[in-house]
Amino acid sequence: VPLSRTVRCTCISISNQPVNPRSLEKLEIIPASQFCPRVEIIATMKKKGEKRCLNPESKAIKNLLKAVSKERSKRSP
């Protein structure tokens, strides 16, 4: 991974594009920390394992988070 101690945040660019929850392998929410003072959301896609940085402020991404958490709560007993 192209990472050095000087890199503070993971996302170089962020995307507003809606993501189909069915095409998601994984959704990571990285809270703000001493290294990166903002929340970062990284989607791993099933296709080719592409990772995409998402805009936490985007309406489409907020809807995605809601959909994913709803799906998770359905699955958990």
Epitope: P2, C11, S13, S15
Partner: antibody, heavy 124, light 109 residues
Framework: QMQLVESGGGVVQPGRSLRLSCTAS????????MHWVRQAPGKGLEWVAV????????FYVDSVKGRFTISRDNSKNTLYLEMNSLRAEDTAIYYC?????????????????WGQGTTVTVSS | EIVLTQSPGTLSLSPGERATLSCRAS???????LAWYQQKPGQAPRLLIY???SRATGIPDRFSGSGSGTDFTLTISRLEPEDFAVYYC??????????FGPGTKVDIL
């Protein structure tokens, strides 16, 4: 459509300074990392500098470290390159380029929008 | 620092022929970090391929990328007159820095 327009190039003497600008339109500038890439006459492409979408990180090629500074003003949709202590070997066309949507340190989507370039000539 | 080498330096072909361009890295590169660009005289570069094999938006399917580790390939299945240009591979490496190869010129025979 998505567009980048560079300005600020010109002829300058060695040791002097110049500031390049790149104005973006047609996309949400504040969402994308941005690069400067240069091309010396008759030569290949050389990456110069990158800035994260929010300015949180900036990186440079070794040959310009300490002399060039990349910055951005998201409220003006503008990217800058401040060039100090210019040398003859900095003579080139300077392009600004947009980092693809969603790029991060784990996956790289390439430089997907480029300006037409501005020419910098360093000569006495 | 990873160095990219492209071969051949110049490739002379006729329209309709297949072009195979090579990009070799001095150390292993993750395919997630390998891109290809096309540049025509007097124009800015254009992104063709990212992630070693994914076509950028609007790129015709005659362009394809493949490879892993240290060896990557850009293939143009049938050269069109507008494909004669210089092609650069590029990698995103640690520090982070973004290194270009020296380019391959595809010439009309």
């Amino acid at each position: 459509q998505m567009q980048l327009v560079e300005s600020g190039g010109g002829v300058v003497q060695p040791g002097r300074s110049l500031r390049l600008s790149c104005t973006a339109s047609g996309f949400t500038f504040s969402n994308n990392g941005m690069h400067w890439v240069r091309q010396a006459p008759g030569k290949g492409l050389e990456w110069v500098a990158v800035i994260w979408f929010d300015g949180m990180n900036k990186f440079y090629v070794d040959s310009v470290k300490g002399r060039f500074t990349i910055s951005r003003d998201n409220s003006k949709n503008t990217l800058y390159l401040e060039m100090n202590s210019l040398r003859a070997e900095d003579t080139a066309i300077y392009y600004c380029a947009r980092e693809g949507d969603g790029s991060g340190i784990y996956y790289y989507y390439g430089m997907d929008v480029w300006g037409q370039g501005t020419t910098v000539t360093v000569s006495s | 620092e990873i160095v990219l080498t492209q071969s051949p330096g110049t490739l002379s072909l006729s329209p309709g022929e297949r072009a195979t361009l090579s990009c070799r890295a001095s150390q292993s590169v993750s395919s997630s970090y390998l891109a290809w660009y096309q540049q025509k005289p007097g124009q800015a570069p254009r992104l063709l391929i990212y992630g070693a094999s994914s076509r950028a938006t609007g790129i015709p399917d005659r362009f394809s990328g493949s490879g892993s580790g240290t060896d990557f390939t850009l293939t143009i299945s049938r050269l069109e007159p507008e494909d004669f240009a210089v092609y650069y591979c590029q990698q995103y490496g640690s520090s982070p820095i973004f290194t270009f190869g020296p380019g391959t010129k595809v010439d009309i025979l």
